[in-house]
């Protein structure tokens, strides 16, 4: 469970894949679409607001923790919209919602090597946000083998 309904801190960052493709968000037909694409050099990267929450669960070795507690994040590219896991469709979607946010909007933050992070579904442990066919998708990861899989690694930059 989340310790409080209030985030402990937030930061604005652009999100890119391990292979330096940008995660972008476009408003189409009154809903937001998420794209994974190579950006032209002069194009400004989209920013995402990461809100960090303390979980009462102790942090694992790979989990990014504060004071021994695991960190969960929500990701919001624009006011009132959040990334959410759709476990049935194995997809990542942007939904407009009000606080308190549903569990599908929370992801366990894992710090990886080379300044990379990964996002594990709160609602489905072992399932991570990843890249599939130039879109974000939910990818099941075998802990013993693939925690370093490039397709679930993301870079955060200001």
């Amino acid at each position: 469970s989340i310790t409080g309904i209030s985030p402990i801190t937030e930061s604005l960052a652009s999100l890119s894949t391990y292979n330096d493709q940008s995660i972008t968000f476009a408003l189409e037909d009154e809903s937001y679409e998420i794209y994974v694409e190579d950006l032209k050099k002069d194009k400004k990267k989209d920013k995402v607001l990461l809100s960090y929450y303390e979980s009462q669960h102790p942090s694992s070795e790979s989990g990014d923790g504060v004071d021994g507690k695991m960190l969960m994040v929500t990701l919001s590219p624009t006011k009132d919209f959040w990334l959410q896991a759709n476990n049935k469709e194995h997809s990542v979607e942007l939904h407009k919602c009000e606080k308190p946010l549903p569990d599908q909007a929370f992801f366990v933050l894992h710090n990886r090597s080379f300044n990379c992070v990964s996002f594990e579904c709160k609602t489905d442990p072992g399932v991570f946000i990843g890249v599939k066919d130039n879109h974000l998708a939910l990818i099941k990861v075998d802990y013993s083998e693939n925690l370093g899989s490039e397709n679930i690694l993301f870079k955060l930059s200001e």
């Epitope: 409080g4 309904i5 209030s6 801190t9 937030e10 960052a13 607001l49 006011k79 200001e158």
Partner: antibody, heavy 128, light 108 residues
Framework: ELQLQESGPGLVKPSETLSLTCTVS??????????WGWIRQPPGKGLEWIGS???????YYNPSLKSRVTISVDTSKNQFSLMLTSVTAADTAVYYC????????????????????WGQGTTVTVSS | EIVLTQSPGTLSLSPGERATLSCRAS???????LAWYQQKPGQAPRLLIY???SRATGIPDRFSGSGSGTDFTLTISRLEPEDFAVYYC?????????FGGGTKVEIK
């Protein structure tokens, strides 16, 4: 355990520049999660936020002090610093450095902060 | 900027009693971005509560925060000898962040 320690001269002459440094130990200033900041407390009075900084160097200042304040960060030394120019007796205070949580306001497109770990404070007197 | 008014200015109570401290904002917050700090003489402030009601790490559960909009409360359910101090509220809903003037909780 994260600890913060302020250092700098305890006495500054009027019209001169106050310079303080905060050294962070037990954790990295390069954290992409938290912010760092300065708060002051004049003798017998309440608390006043001076400003905050992110590891990248992005700064946020109190509008009432903005024209006189510079906050900078040195990630290689795990330190951040405060410079306050043209000081007067009204700047006499205990100066605290702190780690901060930053929260974003979509309407203002600005961050605001609360402080979760504080240094012990250093007294700065402005007097000739 | 948001002005925070704390009341009472001084609260005289005995150990074991319940303390109720008030913090009123000049403008309503859409969020619950309010923090409470404790400060003892000669010491730095210590974070007690953030997000109006979330206890900071290591803070005993006799401290609790509540409220929304313009009215916020810090409650100390049973005062311990070490709780006699000055308490400040602080808003971080919008910049610049601001502090209340403080409430001194003293031994009766």
């Amino acid at each position: 355990e994260l600890q913060l320690q302020e250092s700098g001269p305890g006495l500054v002459k009027p019209s001169e520049t106050l310079s303080l440094t905060c050294t962070v130990s037990g954790g990295s200033i390069r954290s992409s999660i938290f912010y760092w900041g300065w708060i002051r407390q004049p003798p017998g009075k309440g608390l006043e936020w001076i400003g905050s900084i992110y590891y990248s160097g992005r700064t946020y200042y109190n509008p009432s002090l903005k024209s006189r304040v510079t906050i900078s960060v040195d990630t290689s030394k795990n330190q951040f610093s405060l410079m306050l120019t043209s000081v007067t007796a009204a700047d006499t205070a205990v100066y605290y450095c702190a780690r901060a949580g930053g929260l974003y306001n979509w309407n203002d497109e600005s961050f605001s902060f609360y402080m979760d770990v504080w240094g012990q404070g250093t007294t700065v007197t402005v007097s000739s | 900027e948001i002005v925070l008014t704390q009341s009472p200015g001084t609260l005289s109570l005995s150990p074991g009693e319940r303390a109720t401290l008030s913090c009123r904002a000049s403008q309503s917050f859409s969020s619950s971005y309010l923090a409470w700090y404790q400060q003892k003489p000669g010491q730095a402030p210590r974070l007690l509560i953030y997000g109006a009601s979330s206890r900071a790490t290591g803070i005993p559960d006799r401290f609790s925060g509540s409220g929304s909009g313009t009215d916020f409360t810090l409650t100390i359910s049973r005062l311990e000898p070490e709780d006699f101090a000055v308490y400040y509220c602080q808003q971080y809903d919008r910049s610049p962040l601001t502090f209340g003037g403080g409430t001194k909780v003293e031994i009766k």
